[in-house]
């Protein structure tokens, strides 16, 4: 059997007066009862109607009734002021049944042919209601064959009576410190058969205050207290209400942090309801008094639970809790009316005693020992041997608590050793090897560690030397015994330094020529600069103008002398620079391989020989006087030469330092 709705059997048919279409007889009475299925009604209309006309249809008539109600009493052919004929009218039963009664009296003045009518059952549209009648459904009405059903808007649920829409108005929780709540649909009429529960739930310590606003209209009764619809307010302390009628209830100060509002409505009435504006209060905290040199924000008339304030200090003052600094301070009012943190102080910023400046000193300008905001100090370097690097040495205690230079630097100035100072003011004539006097070559460094070599002090913690002189110690820097500040090689009176790291030029290949024969030694501590220990200067860009062919440089060291022994006393020799092509040619012939002299080398010495550096001098500096700055600078590093030092026609070969300035600067800045 097919599934689906079971349709009722069709109900339709024809009715006619007895004898139709002939004339009807006198004294006739005929009754028809028509019944349609539930949810249906009967429709009836006449295709023919011809009955005797009488006042109020007293004689002959057709009467239509549905239940106890007479729908129409019909006679005649056409309607008059007091009688009705059906004409083209259609008649509908009020329910599912229709009674039709035909009657004729004892006489007719002329023959009448009676009536013919047709009927059929049709669906009742229960959703259509006559004006002034109550609607079938509260919200939405849906008609269907044989019946109807109701549905509700969102936020409502259909009551068990299947017609009323009850509001879904329970379980709302308000947690803000203030807000508004109202009856459903306010200010339109509230729904029927509803039970609404609203909760205000604030943090412990708050007290809810309720104010009824705008209008109040809840169904009431003249004698009984709120029997129909009512509003009740419940706290953990007491119950308020019930409320109904048209008078706004007074303010309710609940003295509670939780409030339950209940609103119940019945099935009748048309009232606009209520609106509540709620606020809250709490025990106020003591008014915060700003500390000296500080201010409170925000400024409020009073501060209650959860309210907060922050303290901001004036420029030059800082938040302190005792000795401990704070970046920010915010206090929160607690439920017991106390602040959760004590008030800090706004203390004048104190930059503290300035750090000691290595090789320098500091002077208090503002006043002895004054280190607070805007105080001024002056750093200076030890005269003669140190100079301050790009800094005027003036520092101010700024609001951030740091001593800050005029350029905004927070780091200490740097006292750089003055380089290139020597007791010798000029390069003399070309002599044989001479004994150095104190202060002549204060950059001279003696390097012991397997062999004797030399180097030159750069700044106060670097030594420039030849790569071949320290190659064996490149992985064991601590094995290098570095001495300075002495003239005598074997003297016990010297300044000891130790190596932290050895940096050999990456282009140097040991036992394969002397190209890139340059190395740097980083000392593990800075040395103190004085007249006997002073760094050599690195060449300026313009230095080549003091290193042309025949310009005189000075080499110094404890290397082999003409007698074939290491010198006991520091020796030096003034020698001229040799034309590069001439030097290259001198080392083209055997036993020297071609290309021994590269562009990274310079040569110095006499064609006649006799004046040269020798083994043991390796790594030492070939220095020149910069006549513009009157400072000595390193132009070459003792690297290699002929088998026999000072040989005629051969020259000493030196690493050309000016080619390595970027390499030196990179190593020193990186390490």
């Amino acid at each position: 059997t097919p599934l689906g709705p079971k349709w009722p059997e069709p109900v339709f048919g024809r009715l006619a007066s007895p004898g139709f279409p002939g004339e009807y007889a006198n004294d006739q009475e005929r009754r028809w009862t028509l019944t349609a299925p539930p949810g249906y009604r009967l429709r009836l209309y006449f295709t023919h109607f011809d009955l005797e006309l009488s006042h109020l249809c007293e004689y002959d008539f057709v009467k239509l009734s549905s239940g106890a109600k007479v729908l129409a009493t019909l006679c005649g052919q056409e309607s008059t002021d007091t009688e009705r004929a059906p004409g083209k009218d259609t008649f509908y039963s009020l329910g599912s049944s229709l009674d039709i009664t035909f009657r004729s009296d004892y006489s007719n003045e002329k023959p009448f042919t009676g009536f013919e009518a047709f009927y059929a059952a049709e669906d009742i549209d229960e959703c259509q209601v006559a004006p002034g009648e109550a609607p079938t459904c509260d919200h939405h009405c849906h008609n269907h064959l044989g019946g109807f059903y109701c549905s509700c808007r969102a936020g409502y649920v259909l009551h068990r009576n299947k017609r009323t829409c009850s509001a879904l108005c329970s379980g709302q929780v308000f947690t803000q410190r203030s807000g508004e709540l109202s009856s459903p649909e306010y200010p339109r009429p509230y729904p029927k058969l509803s039970s609404c529960t609203y909760s205000i739930s604030l943090e412990e310590g708050f007290s809810v205050i309720l104010d009824f606003v705008e209008s109040f209209d809840v169904e009431t009764h003249p004698e009984t207290l709120c029997p129909y619809d009512f509003l009740k307010i419940q706290t953990d302390r007491e119950e308020h209400g019930p409320f109904c009628g048209k008078t706004l209830p007074h303010r309710i100060e609940t003295k509670s942090n939780t409030v339950t509002i209940t609103f119940v409505t019945d099935e009748s009435g048309d009232h606009t309801g209520w609106k509540i504006h709620y606020t809250s209060t709490a025990q106020p905290c003591p008014y915060p008094m700003a500390p000296p040199n500080g201010h409170v924000s925000p400024v409020q008339a009073k501060y209650i639970l959860k309210d907060s304030f922050s303290i901001f200090c004036e420029t030059g003052y800082e938040l302190l809790q005792g000795h401990l600094p704070l970046k920010s301070f915010t206090a929160v009012c607690q439920k017991d009316g106390s602040w959760d943190r004590p008030m800090p102080a706004c203390s004048i910023v104190d930059c503290g005693p300035p750090d000691d400046l290595p090789s320098g000193r500091v002077e208090y300008i503002t006043g002895p020992g004054v280190t607070t905001y805007k105080a001024v100090i002056q750093y200076s370097c030890e005269e003669t041997f140190y100079t301050m690097k790009v800094n005027d040495g003036k520092y101010v205690c700024e609001a951030d608590g740091f001593w800050t230079s005029s350029k905004g630097e927070k780091s200490l100035p740097v006292c750089e050793p003055v380089c290139g100072l020597s007791a010798r003011t000029t390069g003399g004539q070309i002599y044989g090897g001479q004994k150095a006097k104190p202060g002549d070559f204060p950059w001279q460094v003696l390097i012991l560690g397997g062999t004797t070599a030399a180097g030159a002090l750069l700044y106060d913690n670097w030594v420039l030397t030849a790569a071949h002189a320290v190659y064996e110690q490149k992985h064991d820097a601590s094995a290098l015994d570095i001495r300075m500040g002495t003239l005598k090689r074997l003297s016990p009176h010297y300044t000891q330094a130790w190596s932290e790291a050895v940096f050999i030029h990456e282009g140097y290949t040991h036992d394969a020529g002397f190209d890139n024969d340059i190395a740097l030694i980083k000392l593990n501590n800075k040395v103190v600069i004085n007249s006997n220990i002073t760094p050599i200067c690195l060449p300026r860009k313009e230095a080549e103008s003091f290193m042309r062919t025949d310009d005189i440089g000075t080499a110094s060291g404890w290397g082999l002398t003409q007698r074939g022994f290491l010198a006991r006393n520091l020796m030096y020799v003034d020698i001229p620079i040799v034309d590069h092509q001439k030097c290259t040619a001198a080392y083209e012939k055997p036993p020297y391989p071609r290309g021994s002299v590269t562009a990274n080398m310079l040569c110095a010495g006499l064609e006649s020989g006799g004046k040269d550096s020798c083994r043991g001098d390796s790594g030492g500096a070939l220095v020149f006087l910069d006549s513009e700055t009157e400072r000595w600078f390193v132009g070459g590093i003792v690297s290699w030469g002929s088998m026999n030092c000072g040989e005629a026609g051969q020259y000493g070969v030196y690493t050309k330092v000016i080619n390595y300035i970027p390499w030196i600067e990179n190593i020193i800045s990186d390490f």
Epitope: H323, P325, P342, F402
Partner: antibody, heavy 114, light 107 residues
């Protein structure tokens, strides 16, 4: 949740430098507060060594000023302690803490011995 | 430096009883005093700051009072987990200093 964790060698030779690091999680050391180093020699009371503040300023116990350095690495949210020229008297449990002690590390024992 | 002197050095109390610990500062430290609890092998645990402010999570039985030079930590009803060493700490001025501690033991 704020957590502090000390790390570093548990044994240091006399005259060498003691180095410890405190790694902070759950709070940025530049956001606020002072970040302390505190130590407790065996059976003795706590001794505050110094702090580095949110801004990088330092404050040291005058009794240690010539030997102590506190620094920080903001990229790693760490602050460090260096104590030079140590002796047996520097043997202690070393703690890092925040401000007036609302959070502490679990402590690390450093023994100074040859 | 400011010396913080705690008394007594040892306090013997029965569980449920009240314990009152004293701390005296050699100079005025305002209310810049904190109290800590330390158990063997553990780092200190902060209880009170600014003399009387209890840290969140610290039971209400712990309370602090005092200002200037005299400070008190009170444990209203000792629980078994409260037996430990208690330190006071001033952070008013450099150097920050700690008291020698009071050991609270079971009577």
């Amino acid at each position: 949740q704020v957590q502090l964790q000390e790390s570093g060698p548990g044994l240091v030779k006399p005259s060498e430098t003691l180095s410890l690091t405190c790694t902070v999680s759950g709070y940025s050391i530049t956001s606020d507060y002072a970040w302390n180093w505190i130590r407790q020699p065996p059976g003795k009371k706590l001794e505050w060594m110094g702090y580095i503040s949110y801004s990088g300023r330092t404050s040291y116990n005058p009794s240690l000023k010539s030997r102590i350095t506190i620094s920080r690495d903001t990229s790693k949210n760490q602050f460090s302690l260096k104590l030079s020229s140590v002796t047996a008297a520097d043997t202690a449990v070393y703690y890092c803490s925040r401000h007036y002690g609302d959070y502490w590390g679990q402590g690390t024992l450093v023994t100074v011995s040859s | 430096e400011i010396v913080m002197t705690q008394s007594p050095a040892t306090l013997s109390v029965s569980p449920g009883e009240r314990a009152t610990l004293s701390c005296k500062a050699s100079q005025n430290v305002g209310t810049n005093v904190a109290w800590y609890q330390q158990k063997p092998g553990q780092s200190p645990r902060a209880l009170i700051y600014s003399a009387s402010y209890r840290y969140s999570g610290i039971p209400a039985r712990f309370s602090g009072s005092g200002s200037g030079t005299e400070f008190t930590l009170t444990i209203s009803s000792l629980q078994s987990e409260d037996f430990a060493v208690y330190f006071c700490h001033q952070y008013n001025s450099n150097p920050l200093t700690f008291g020698g501690g009071t050991k609270v033991e079971i009577k």
